[in-house]
Interface confidence: low
């Protein structure tokens, strides 16, 4: 998928299976990828956790829980806010579009998470305090954790090199991964464009995603996830100025 | 059945008296009904998976609030246990007065603290 | 124009399996369940089952259970109807329905039928 | 033996009122708001005529109403007309069934 982090770099990752998005003393989040196509090194996001930590006399320990398909709008012991505690209202669950888009308010933390099923596949957005982001006990064991830190360099796609590549061939070669040789016929190179136009005005790294995301799958649902992961970012983001990112250097592969 | 959704049905006719076209001065009590139906179908959609009335409520509250102008936030025609938070920036806000540092304890070094944003979609 | 157009007749041996599709046109295909129903030859109506096409989930008339299967391929818009180990009084015609989109339950737009003959 | 019963036939004269009954439990019929009525002709497939006891779909003339009294739902058809022969079946939703009439049938002598 592709990963904004807390710095604001932007990747496209392969990282398969179960990887922590985030994870500090009252938040902890992770997520499960999956190849788009048999044999693809592009991955979405089929799974996600989310764990709220038990906090004072605030919330007991709650668990929310999306997967492909189900986008429940309730911690999965059933309950839609913090618990049975005194301050259990600062934290809540709103289903803004039954199955298909839920936010999580964890006031007590000034903490909003936009959770979305686009297509088949899951979105994943947050505005948290840079305190509470820096609230680790052991910094030493947060190596992997992909807001924080991105994914590793070998797990990332330069996704813009591709899309200097398939340039106005319709190409569906994935730069150094392709994906694999039964993919379903996918857009030409011209038409993605058009397509992720059509959503998306500006020609950003959200734009460039979008084409990428078109060219590898053929699956029109992903213009529509990088529309919204783009109107999340200006719903959350604190920074205005910074809603949409460019291609900068080419050292940090997709940034 | 654990599955109360004829329940939420028979709340929401109760509570609008069968009038599915409310007169356009009804329309803020008739969205009020329509928001509470909404809670309570949200409150036993874990017990409704496969409930035939389950879906054709969830499917109709949705085009009953577009047909009617009614926004998703406001006030219900039930006790108000869980009104929805306002919606955009405004994290801060309390949704009830008896919440105290709950609201507030992540930043009680800064008035306002420094967000930060993170996001993951598409493959 | 809304409408649900079924597959076309097909003759069936004892102990086989049949296959029904309806195609939707016209509406959001997710936005409604489909009910199938089915009318055995001078008899009435008898309710299958139900699919909701946006969770794949599925309510099943009880003496049908586990020789009834219904699918959607939101691709193309379409509800299958799959009935197994067919006997003889499984002789129908079979309608889909698209259940009215609604706090209320009703079936609004009916496709044509298809008839299945099941005879050794 | 269907779960909810209907008279076999009935039977007016053009312009006269007939009523179809339909009768079930508190379940099927007496607490559900889900009552629907359906008409029929030979060789069609059916068509929605009223939904929720009353509601009419639109292009459903208004000689068409509906009923519920106790456990019992009502389809009345005021000022017969020819075109009004056909079957007719109510169905409830209870629970997660639905429950189909036996079906009536209304000749227009």
């Known amino acids: 998928p592709h990963l904004r982090t807390f710095t604001d770099r932007f990747q496209t990752c392969k990282v398969q299976g179960a990887w922590p998005l985030i994870d500090n003393n009252y938040l902890n989040v992770q997520v499960t990828n999956t190849p788009v196509l048999p044999g693809s090194a592009a991955t979405a996001t089929s799974k996600l956790t989310i764990i709220f930590k038990n906090f004072q006399e605030c919330v007991d320990q709650k668990v929310y829980q999306a997967e492909m398909d189900e986008l429940p709008a309730a911690f999965v012991d059933g309950s839609k806010n913090g618990g049975d505690k005194h301050g259990a209202n600062s934290l809540k669950i709103t289903e803004k579009v039954s199955g298909q888009h839920v936010e999580i308010r964890a006031k007590y933390i000034g903490t909003t998470i936009v959770v979305r099923q686009v297509g088949r596949y899951l979105t994943f957005a947050v505005r948290v305090p840079e305190e509470v982001v820096n609230a680790v006990e052991d910094w030493d064991s947060q190596g992997l954790y992909l807001c924080l830190r991105g994914c590793p360099l070998n797990q990332q796609i330069d996704f813009q090199a591709f899309h200097t590549n398939t340039e106005g061939t319709g190409a569906r070669r994935l730069a150094a991964a392709s994906p694999a040789p039964t993919a379903p016929e996918t857009f030409p190179y011209e038409t993605a464009v058009a397509k992720c136009k059509e959503k998306l005005p500006v020609e950003d790294l959200y734009y460039q995603a979008c084409v990428f995301d078109l060219l590898t799958t053929g699956d029109v649902n992903f213009t529509l996830a990088a529309y919204y992961a783009l109107e999340d970012v200006k719903m959350l983001h604190s920074n205005k100025d910074k809603l949409h990112l460019y291609e900068r250097t080419r050292d940090l592969p997709g940034r | 059945s654990p599955c109360k959704i004829l329940k939420c049905n028979s709340e929401f006719w109760s509570a609008t008296s069968g009038s599915h076209a409310p007169a356009s001065d009804d329309t803020p009590e008739f969205c009020a009904a329509l928001r509470s139906y909404a809670l309570c179908t949200r409150r036993t959609a874990r017990t409704c998976r496969g409930d035939l009335a389950y879906h054709s409520a969830v499917h109709g509250i949705e085009d009953l609030m577009s047909q009617h102008n009614c926004s998703k936030d406001g006030p219900t025609s039930q006790p108000r246990l869980h009104t929805l938070p306002p919606a955009g920036d405004s994290q801060e806000r309390s949704d009830s007065p008896e919440i105290c540092h709950c609201e507030k304890s992540f930043h009680k070094h800064s008035a306002t603290p420094n967000y930060t944003h993170c996001g993951l979609f598409g493959d | 124009e809304v409408q649900l157009v079924q597959s076309g007749a097909e003759v069936k041996k004892p102990g086989a399996s049949v296959k029904v599709s309806c195609k939707a046109s016209?509406?959001?295909?997710?936005?409604?369940?489909i009910s199938w129903v089915r009318q055995a030859p001078g008899q009435g109506l008898d309710w299958m089952g139900w699919?909701?096409?946006?969770?794949?989930?599925?309510n099943y008339a009880q003496k049908l259970q586990g020789r009834v299967t219904m699918t959607t391929d939101t691709s193309t818009s379409t509800a299958y109807m799959e009935l197994s180990s067919l006997r003889s009084e499984d002789t129908a015609v079979y309608y889909c329905?698209?259940?009215?989109?609604?706090?209320?339950?009703?079936?609004?737009?009916w496709g044509q039928g298809t008839l299945v003959t099941v005879s050794s | 033996q269907s779960a909810l019963t209907q008279p076999r036939s009935v039977s007016g004269s053009p312009g006269q009122s007939v009523t179809i009954s339909c009768t079930g439990t508190?379940?099927?019929?007496?607490?559900?708001?889900?009552v629907s009525w359906y008409q029929q002709h030979p060789g069609k497939a059916p068509k929605l005529m009223l939904y929720d006891v009353t509601k009419r779909p639109s292009g459903v003339p208004d000689r068409f109403s509906g009923s519920k009294s106790g456990n019992t739902a009502s389809l009345t058809i005021s000022g017969l007309q020819a075109e009004d022969e056909a079957d007719y079946y109510c169905v409830s939703y209870a629970g997660t069934d639905t429950l189909f009439g036996g079906g009536t049938k209304v000749t227009v002598l």
């Open positions: 508190s379940s099927s019929v007496g607490d559900s708001i889900y």
């Open positions: 329905a698209r259940v009215g989109s609604g706090p209320y339950y009703y079936m609004d737009v």
């Open positions: 016209g509406y959001t295909f997710t936005s409604h369940g």
């Open positions: 699919i909701s096409p946006y969770s794949g989930n599925t």
